[in-house]
């Protein structure tokens, strides 16, 4: 330096040579080696930038600084000897820091932590895998919802933390042999109804569902106010009873009593009580037509209303009733006559014979249930000679066809009226409450008593009237043969039916009436 | 031949519970409602409630409902009554019998004496 | 609830006599039954459905009535039949009995 001066206006980071020239500080370089202009700056050299001499050596990070530079290990790496900064490879002493070793919590749960040369992984558990916005944070995988499809259509997946498991869907089990939860589960459905895991009332009849089961009326049975059918907790009531009253507009004091027996033995009725309600109701019923009482005085059209009523209740009743027995073949017989005859069955494929002390009834099995129906199937033929009082002077309608056949071979209707009642009136019920037209005839013979010579013999059914009373009928029921005591008749449907005769002189020998037994 | 067999004379103490059972024979045991009726000494017969073994309904007169208890176990044939909260007045011979409406109660078991004494 | 009224409540009666007795009902009933009761026994059933007689009952009981009233006959006594006689409606719920008429030895 000149003992002549040194130059004041020497720019930042320089110091000045002589009076007239600057030079930069160590560290900092200008554009020309000696500065002559206070113009000129001196600005800082990045002795870390590529083409720089300085190498700290491996596993560091040169640090650039104003005027000078750092070497300081890379992280995940410290020096050995301790210091933080150096200035050269040879001064580097870096190597590779465990922080596996020094944070065993470094990975949280479901992971584990692997060093690697200047960091560390997380390698997640099966199960798990790397959160992506927090690579070190293993979470659950869904593998219910990831698409994989783990498990097998009978099952569903149920993810747990971790790991997730096949359970049969609820009404399902494994199949004999496989687990119940790894993914090689194979499930089927059980059978609640047979197994007896169901919770139907015993109002209803089980139906079993895949993976599940539903609870239906009993036949003849309703569900209970508000409450729907086929549901899980469907309650219902029986119908057998409620619709059962006093004919409208029929006064009789025996007939409300006889209805207040009905009505009672509804009111507890269960199906185990089916039989002995049966009998009671039948037993009721002899009674009530061995002393009508006050029914004897009302008007005739008014007693065939209440018969007709009665029939058609009956009818109802005994085949709502029926369902509910054990299968077997029931003979029930009263004092004034009344008889029953019931046989209930598995569906069978055979004919059925019903044989009572007055009549026979023969029909096809496969007419009984309807199809779709789980019931068993039932027939039933009921006698019920005391209706006899009742359906006095009943009428008897005749499809035009018939009626003019009787006048061509008869001279007539005789003056004294209505036909005679030979034989019991008897009911035919089936389980199937469809009976308008049988795919089968169903075929009836009566014994009766002796046939007035020259009158002719029909066969005939009640046919309920709009009116809610009705009048003998012979649509659809044929006279296939008749003997003085005995006649057989086929019908093509089924309803109550007797044997009449008519009050027709016949001319002649009349070969219809022959005997065809 | 139809058999109600009840169980031993109880002695209780007021306040406390006891549970009688009729055990039915030579019937379809859910063919019947199952009544039970009590006798208080001297005094005529008191209807208690009936058990349906068919499928559980029970009935009870209101003097007991919520105090007595009918029950019946279809696999072994036997219905039960439990009274609850025994009062002295409860001392009487309890009866269990097969019931039907149109029937009445045809048959009757032997009585279980109940002693309510403290 | 059907409350049953027998009277009379104690009546007395020789072996020969014709005995009646009768059950009223505050509502209409149509199923009457009547049970016979003796001391320290069990009752038994004895009349049902107004008048049908039980198994082993003989015929000198019978029974009758409607609605309201109900009455219950022995044609002739016999020393046998002195006992406690209840009727039983099971019409309505609840169930109930009649308090009894007691029949004693003249």
């Known amino acids: 330096q000149d003992s002549r001066g040194c130059a004041r206006w020497c720019p930042q980071d320089s110091s000045c040579v002589n009076a007239t020239a600057c030079r930069c500080n160590p560290g900092f370089s200008s554009f020309s080696e000696i500065i002559t202009t206070p113009m000129e700056t001196c600005d800082d050299i990045n002795e870390c930038a590529t083409l720089s001499k300085v190498s700290c050596g491996k596993f560091s990070d040169c640090w650039n600084t104003e005027g000078s530079y750092d070497c300081v290990c890379s992280p995940g790496y410290e020096p050995v000897s301790g210091a933080k900064t150096f200035k050269n490879e040879s001064e580097n002493t870096c190597q590779d820091v465990d922080e596996c070793q020094q944070n065993p919590r470094l990975c949280k749960s479901y992971g584990t932590c692997v060093n690697t040369l200047g960091s560390y992984t997380c390698q997640c558990l099966p199960g798990f895998k790397l959160k992506p916005e927090d690579p070190k944070l293993c979470t659950d995988v869904n593998e219910c919802t990831s698409g994989q499809n783990p498990c097998h259509s009978s099952t569903h997946c149920l993810n747990n933390v971790g790991s997730y498991q096949c359970r049969c869907r609820p009404g399902w089990q494994p199949i004999p042999g496989s687990p119940n939860g790894p993914n090689n589960t194979v499930c089927e459905d059980v059978d609640e109804c047979s197994s007896g895991q169901h919770q139907c009332d015993s109002s209803t009849v089980c139906f079993n569902t895949v993976g599940s089961y539903s609870c239906r009326c009993r036949p003849g049975w309703k569900p209970r106010h508000g409450i729907p059918n086929n549901q899980k907790d469907t309650v219902c009531e029986d119908m057998t009873f409620s619709t059962w009253t006093p004919p409208p507009g029929v006064h009789s004091q025996t007939l409300s009593r006889f209805f207040d027996k009905v009505q009672d033995l509804g009111r507890d009725y269960k199906p185990g009580l089916a039989n002995n309600t049966i009998q009671s109701i039948l037993q009721a019923l002899d009674e009530l037509l061995e002393a009508p009482g006050d029914l004897e005085t009302l008007p005739r059209l008014q007693q065939h209303c209440v018969a007709s009523h009665l029939l058609d209740g009956l009818e109802d009743v005994l085949r709502g009733l029926s369902k509910n027995l054990s299968n077997g073949l029931l003979n029930f017989s009263y004092p004034a006559g009344t008889e029953l005859s019931l046989e209930v069955q598995k569906q069978v494929d055979r004919s059925v014979t019903l044989r009572q002390n007055q009549a026979v009834m023969q029909l096809d099995w496969n007419q009984a249930q309807k199809s779709g129906d789980p019931g068993p199937s039932v027939v039933g033929l009921v006698s019920i000679p005391g209706m006899g009082k009742l359906l006095a002077e009943a009428p008897l309608v005749l499809e035009p066809e018939k009626q003019m056949l009787l006048h061509e071979t008869h001279q007539g209707l005789l003056q004294d009226g209505s036909p005679i009642l030979l034989s019991d009136v008897i009911s035919a019920f089936l389980s199937n409450n469809d009976t308008q037209n049988l795919s089968s005839p169903v075929t009836f013979t009566f014994s009766h008593r002796s046939v007035i010579p020259r009158q002719k013999v029909l066969c005939v059914f009640w046919e309920h009237g709009q009116n809610g009373c009705g009048h003998w009928a012979t649509t659809g029921c044929s006279t296939i043969g008749t003997r003085d005591t005995s006649t057989i008749c086929r019908c093509t449907h089924l309803s109550s039916f007797a044997v009449l005769m008519a009050h027709y002189d016949v001319q002649e020998e009349d070969p219809v009436l022959t005997v065809i037994t | 031949q139809v058999q109600l067999q009840q169980s031993g004379a109880e002695v209780k103490k007021p306040g406390a519970s006891v549970k009688l059972s009729c055990k039915a024979s030579g019937y379809t045991f859910t063919n019947y409602w199952m009544q039970w009726i009590r006798q208080a000494p001297g005094q005529g017969l008191e209807w208690i409630g009936a058990v349906y073994p068919g499928d559980g309904d029970t009935r009870y007169t209101q003097k007991f409902q919520g105090r007595a208890t009918l029950t019946a176990d279809t696999s072994i044939s036997t219905a039960y009554m439990e009274v609850s909260r025994l009062r002295s007045d409860d001392t009487a011979v309890y009866y269990c019998?097969?019931?039907?409406?149109?029937?009445?109660?045809?048959?009757w078991g032997q009585g279980t004496t109940v002693t309510v004494s403290s | 609830e059907i409350v049953l009224t027998q009277s009379p409540a104690t009546m007395s009666a020789s072996p020969g006599e014709r005995v009646t007795m009768s059950c009223s009902a505050s509502?209409?009933?149509?199923?009457m039954h009547w049970y016979q009761q003796k001391s320290g026994l069990s009752p038994k059933r004895w009349i049902y459905d107004t008048s049908k007689l039980a198994s082993g009952v003989p015929d000198r009981f019978s029974g009758s009535g409607s609605g309201t009233d109900y009455t219950f006959t022995i044609s002739r006594m016999e020393p046998e039949d002195f006992a406690t006689y209840y009727c039983q409606q099971w019409s309505s719920n609840p169930l109930t009995f009649g308090g009894g008429t007691k029949l004693e030895i003249k």
């Open positions: 509502s209409s009933v149509s199923y």
């Open positions: 019998a097969r019931g039907f409406t149109a029937y009445g109660m045809d048959y």
